[in-house]
């Protein structure tokens, strides 16, 4: 999906209400200098095509962001505004089906949302030069 | 299987008011996003509004905002779309749409039309 046609600003406030907060309660008890941030976005599209993939990718050691509420939501403000991002299918199927019914939470999975954390500050700010 | 049944819609005059309602069978109404979507004819499918069933966090299209309202009673498994001062653009089919509890794709209604016109 080419993410440029969304409305960022719309997703920038979608995030800063309720996205952020989701996000921060998943890292609770995780110091915030526990993990390095490794993926890096250049721009608003980059940053949300980068954000998509950790979000809903299923990744070695953590295959279950998919049904977080900040994975939903995310979902949903992308749905809302970037055109035709509904029609898109998200290859989480698998590791849906075998996802366990206990919550169980990974230090991969606090890692991934780490990295998401810092994608989403640098989508909420596109006019920052990359280090 | 989860199935979305969607209801509520009609023809109705401009500036009049209808309420779409969309009833969730099996347990995917629980913490989850519930959305609306629209599709004109000959035109893409485009979000209207959700809302998380989590904590009442809602989302709403520009072209939508304060006329319509969206809400969800998790005791009914319902979601329902408030819709007024409607207009003509806004005629289209309406879809209800809800997060997978198998995949990470939408669980789609069958659609409901609604008709703006004089």
């Known amino acids: 999906y080419d993410f440029t046609n969304c409305d960022f600003e719309k997703i920038k406030a979608a995030y800063l209400s309720t996205i952020s907060k989701d996000l921060i309660t998943y890292m609770s008890g995780t110091k915030s200098t526990e993990f390095n941030n490794t993926v890096s976005c250049s721009n608003r599209p980059h940053c949300l095509t980068e954000i998509q993939s950790l979000t809903f990718n299923p990744t070695a050691g953590c295959a279950s962001l998919a049904k977080e509420m900040f994975a939903m939501k995310t979902k949903a403000a992308l749905a809302i505004w970037c055109p035709g991002y509904s029609e898109t299918q998200i290859n989480a199927t698998q590791a849906m089906k075998k996802r366990r019914k206990r919550k169980v939470t990974t230090n991969k999975c606090l890692e991934q949302v780490s990295q998401l954390q810092g994608l989403w500050r640098r989508f909420n700010r596109p006019l920052l030069k990359q280090q | 299987e989860v199935q979305l049944v969607e209801s509520g819609g009609g023809l109705v005059q401009p500036g009049g008011s209808l309420r779409l309602s969309c009833a969730a069978s099996?347990?995917?109404?629980?913490?989850?996003?519930m959305c609306w979507f629209r599709q004109a004819p000959g035109k893409e499918r485009e979000g209207v509004s959700c809302?998380?069933?989590?904590?009442?966090?809602?989302y709403y299209a520009d072209s939508v905002k304060g006329r319509f309202t969206i809400s969800a009673d998790n005791s009914k498994n319902t979601a329902y779309l408030q819709m007024n001062s409607l207009k003509p653009e806004d005629t289209a089919v309406y879809y209800c749409?809800?997060?997978?509890?198998?995949?990470?794709?939408?669980?789609w209604g069958q659609g409901t039309l609604v008709t703006v016109s004089s």
């Open positions: 099996g347990n995917i109404f629980t913490r989850n996003i």
């Open positions: 749409a809800a997060d997978s509890e198998t995949s990470g794709n939408w669980v």
């Open positions: 809302i998380s069933t989590g904590d009442g966090s809602t």
